[in-house]
């Protein structure tokens, strides 16, 4: 129940007043304003947008709005020396070259400063050699090549299709396999939905469209030159050779027209099975090298991009809390885009802008939230979550003591089918209760709740009558808050129908064709899905900042801990003899989960009964809830990933976008049958079970009665 001591508005109308103030027409207007020119991180245009947002947030009524700047490592193509890939004949002549830019969309022909497609942070180089097609370049794809097909990628240039996993993982895998270059391409099987036209006539990717993106493996480090600390004016910077997460081989992205020219000549081994075939009219041969007539031809990459320390700007707005100003609820999303950012990020930034406007309107009427709300427009997200991470590094001591929750606000839509939510289990009940109060925007669900349409279209695989809520992974600005600092986090957006649309992300992701018109014509002409996402994100922030008792249910954590313990145990039980031989037991983990369940249940009972008029007891109970997420943080971090410190969740080591539960144990068990030294390998499994069991038990004890 929302209420606040310091408001002129009747308590029960607080949330309603806030939600009623949100307008689809405003979101549309803001999106248009944010997408007319590119806003690449580190450019003057993005600095100007930061100042515009600062000014408008002040006008909207926030108490203060400041720019927080950092000097971080970014990457840009060389303007006079373009990147491209060629096929060369035996004399070294270039007989085919990939395109140097995407054909601009209608109406944007005269826009300057459209960065050509490139893989950010690729080193320079001009490798040449035979091509090997590696499917999605996932761990399992390289296992197939290496172990089953006996194909050696050492000294080869590999070509991989985008999709399934984060591109940085693809590059890391290729590097480990000994490749000397990587070509990334968008296959129509993944980026062209059947029955839909290409842009500008539909929302599909044209053959000349290319996905930009960074190829770092930062593992939560932030700026590659200042891991763990803010990239401020007195920062000590590592040398480039010691920088975190930079790729060591040249990488370049291309579209499917150019990919066709490379793949159609491929010889060598046939694809191992149909899962290696895309939708191009090519054989999808694995190689190495070209077929008979073309066997003397090679592929050559020409990469001339440069890494440069560049200033970036976050916008940080504050709406001071009336009762608990030292408790922070954060709503953050990024502002920088690869080109126009029609979806990523400006569909999210426009929603944040409207949420700020609505909160500002209430504040001007005399209302204040109970807790402080911080609003953030992050910079350089596309270059490795740099703006958010640097700010969190600079403010880590405040955040770990005062951070209640972080709600992420990148792209509001990646489709228009149903809601998608990833969050901490602490927020499950908040999301359920909120979506039951909101109207569904979906056709065929008029007059029904968002909860109902969401549950119907995206049912939970475990609990009937409930919607699917996913684990947090990474690839967005919540990472530092959740995975490093242990602040309860969540994200929500509208998504596609994953059952019928098997393509990865949305087809025009990170291309020049991600424009305002893409959204306005094809995804959300009425901006009703944007409005719904604004209501979900804004409603979550409102409740987190305003409810007397924090809207966290620790019992939901108990449920998932049991589920995750069962899952990791069943993975381990694929090795029953080794578990006996090396005395591997999960008893300690299951015992800790049982204790957590019992203590969480008792805590929830006390939460119903305590005297909410006693501010000391109220604060004590709220602090136990706030610090529960923090209790899952291991200060030592995960093995070889010191900035991923959450013991229950981490980004998958094989796909940064995906979340993995009990990641320490999972990674210790992964491919354990190929570890040469089984006693050492199973010893590490035992150590990780110990860490997990201890952490769960320690977290449980934070919920016990304090004395």
């Amino acid at each position: 129940k929302s209420s606040n001591e310091a408001t002129n508005i009747t308590p029960k109308h607080n949330m309603k007043a806030f939600l009623d103030e949100l307008k689809a027409e405003n979101i549309k207007k803001f999106l248009y304003n944010f997408t007319q020119i590119p806003h690449l991180a580190g450019t003057e245009q993005n600095f100007q947008l930061a100042k515009q947002i600062q000014s408008q947030w002040k006008e909207f009524g926030l108490d203060s709005v400041e720019l927080a700047h950092y000097d971080v490592l970014l990457s840009y193509p060389n303007k006079t020396h373009p990147n491209y890939i060629s096929i060369i004949n035996e004399d070294g002549n270039e007989i085919f070259n990939t395109s140097l830019f995407e054909p601009p969309p209608p109406g944007y022909e005269n826009v300057s400063d459209i960065v050509p497609p490139f893989s950010a942070f690729s080193p320079q180089g001009m490798p040449e050699g035979d091509l090997v097609y590696v499917n999605y370049a996932r761990t399992e794809d390289f296992f197939k090549l290496e172990r089953d097909m006996k194909i050696n990628c050492s000294g080869k240039i590999v070509i991989a299709r985008y999709g399934k996993v984060f591109r940085g993982n693809k590059v890391k895998n290729a590097q480990l396999a000994g490749a000397k270059g990587v070509i990334l391409y968008s296959d129509p099987a993944d980026y062209f939905a059947p029955g839909v036209k290409s842009y500008p006539d539909g929302w599909n990717l044209p053959g000349g469209g290319v996905q930009r993106g960074n190829i770092l493996n930062l593992n939560g480090a932030g700026d590659p030159l200042t891991p763990g600390y803010p990239a401020n004016e007195y920062a000590y910077r590592r040398g480039i050779a010691e920088a975190v997460g930079l790729p060591s081989i040249p990488v370049h992205p291309i579209g499917y027209y150019d990919a066709q020219k490379l793949l159609e000549k491929m010889g060598g081994s046939a694809p191992p099975d149909s899962s290696w075939r895309g939708s191009l009219k090519v054989p999808y041969n694995v190689g190495p090298g070209f077929t008979g007539n073309f066997s003397t031809q090679k592929v050559k990459m020409h990469i001339h991009s440069t890494n440069e320390v560049t200033r970036i700007y976050n916008v940080i707005g504050t709406l001071r809390g009336a009762v608990e100003p030292d408790r922070y609820v954060i709503l953050g999303g990024h502002r920088d885009s690869w080109v126009f950012g029609g979806i990523d990020p400006q569909s999210g930034a426009a929603v944040v802008h409207e949420i700020v406007r609505s909160f500002g309107t209430l504040k001007k009427e005399g209302w204040r939230p109970r807790r402080t709300i911080l609003f953030a427009s992050w910079d350089a997200e596309e270059f490795g979550l740099l703006g958010s991470t640097e700010w969190a590094e600079e403010n880590s001591r405040l955040l770990q003591e005062r951070g209640v929750a972080y709600i992420n606000a990148d792209s509001s839509i990646e489709g228009n089918y149903t809601l998608r939510v990833d969050c901490t289990p602490l927020m499950y009940s908040l999301v359920h209760n909120l979506t039951k109060e909101l109207k569904s925007p979906d056709e065929g669900f008029e007059g029904k709740s968002l909860y109902e349409s969401w549950t119907k279209k995206s049912p939970s695989p475990e609990f009937s009558g409930m919607p699917r809520i996913s684990k947090l992974g990474s690839g967005n600005d919540f990472e530092v808050f959740f995975q490093r600092l242990g602040i309860a986090s969540g994200r929500a957006r509208y998504t596609k129908n994953w059952e019928t649309n098997k393509f990865s992300g949305y087809p025009l992701y990170h291309s020049v064709y991600e424009t305002y018109e893409l959204v306005e014509k094809f995804y959300d002409p009425m901006f009703k899905y944007h409005l719904t996402v604004a209501q979900v994100r804004g409603g979550m922030v409102f409740e987190l900042a305003n409810s007397i008792v924090l809207p966290f249910d620790c019992r939901d954590y108990a449920v998932v801990l049991r589920k995750y313990a069962d899952k990791i145990y069943s993975i381990s039980m694929k090795h029953p003899q080794e578990m006996k031989t090396y005395s591997v037991s999960f008893d300690s983990l299951f015992s800790a989960v049982k204790n957590f369940t019992e203590i969480a249940s008792k805590f929830s009972e006390r939460l119903q009964d305590f005297d909410k008029s006693n501010p000391i007891v109220l604060r004590m109970m709220n602090d136990q809830l706030m610090f529960l997420e923090r209790a899952f943080i291991d200060p030592l971090g995960l093995p070889d990933r010191p900035f991923y410190r959450h013991v229950i969740y981490a980004p998958s080591s094989h796909n940064k976008y995906a979340g993995e539960s009990f990641p320490g144990i999972y990674d210790a068990l992964f491919d354990i049958e190929s570890k040469v030294d089984p006693s050492k390998a199973w010893g590490e499994v035992k150590r990780q079970i110990y860490v997990a069991a201890f952490t769960v038990q320690a977290a449980a004890e934070t919920l016990s009665e304090v004395a």
Epitope: E146, D148, A177, E673, S674
Partner: antibody
Framework: EVQLVESGGGVVQPGRSLRLSCATS????????MHWVRQAPGKGLEWVAV??????????SYAESVKGRFAISREDSKSTLYLQMNSLRAEDTAVYYC??????????WGQGTLVTVSS | DIVMTQTPLSLPVTPGEPASISCRSS???????????LHWYLQKPGQSPQLLIY???NRFSGVPDRFSGSGSGTDFTLKISRVEAEDVGVYYC?????????FGGGTKVEIK
């Protein structure tokens, strides 16, 4: 404790057959590629054959010297590896070891069983 | 097939002194993933081979730290910093980068 125990060796005439067994314990046999390696008296080690796991359709490969005559097989339910040796020759005389592969390394070896091919 | 050549054939040693065995392959043993699948085994008299060093330089569990491996490409070395009486036997290098997997001819280490 990981154990591999070979059996089935003995004296056999040239041209005849013999079947070796390797009973294993202490590890989940079905998860691992298994090999046979042999050592002629007073000589060095020679790799003979490998069999993969169920997910790889129990694929096998052989040294040229035994191809077409020897067949490697496994019975996962019994955690046992076999080597069927046909058309035996004098040069097949050796101690035969079964070995468990881990990450492309032969890590654990049995104590061996001696096969003598003699008329 | 890859030929593995070990030198010396025989190595008489004094306890407490260092010893070194060389192994040369007829082709590079560098595999993809940057791995070099060159391993060392010791076969003590009347016993089966036991793994000492895997992938050039990694000591297997329980192997004393007086044993070390080094090398790259085609040239590899096993060193024993201070030989002990229990180290006698035949040492084999082995490559598993290329099929078929092959072994060196062995080096017999005996106490002087």
């Amino acid at each position: 404790e990981v154990q591999l125990v070979e059996s089935g060796g003995g004296v056999v005439q040239p041209g005849r057959s013999l079947r070796l067994s390797c009973a294993t314990s202490g590890f989940t046999f079905s998860n691992y590629r298994m090999h046979w390696v042999r050592q002629a008296p007073g000589k060095g080690l020679e790799w003979v054959a490998v069999i993969t796991v169920k997910s790889d359709n129990y694929g096998s490969s052989y040294a040229e010297s035994v191809k077409g005559r020897f067949a490697i097989s496994r019975e996962d339910s019994k955690s046992t590896l076999y080597l069927q040796m046909n058309s035996l020759r004098a040069e097949d005389t050796a101690v035969y070891y079964c070995s468990r592969e881990l990450g492309q390394v032969l890590v654990f070896w049995g104590q061996g069983t001696l096969v003598t091919v003699s008329s | 097939d890859i030929v593995m050549t070990q030198t010396p054939l025989s190595l008489p040693v004094t306890p407490g002194e260092p010893a070194s065995i060389s192994c040369r392959s007829s082709q590079s043993l560098v595999h993809s993933y940057g791995n070099t699948y060159l391993h060392w085994y010791l076969q003590k008299p009347g016993q089966s081979p036991q793994l000492l060093i895997y992938k050039v330089s990694n000591r297997f569990s329980g192997v004393p730290d007086r044993f070390s491996g080094s090398g790259s490409g085609t040239d590899f070395t096993l060193k024993i910093s201070r030989v002990e009486a229990e180290d006698v036997g035949v040492y084999y290098c082995s490559q598993t980068t290329h099929v078929p997997w092959t072994f060196g001819g062995g080096t017999k280490v005996e106490i002087k």
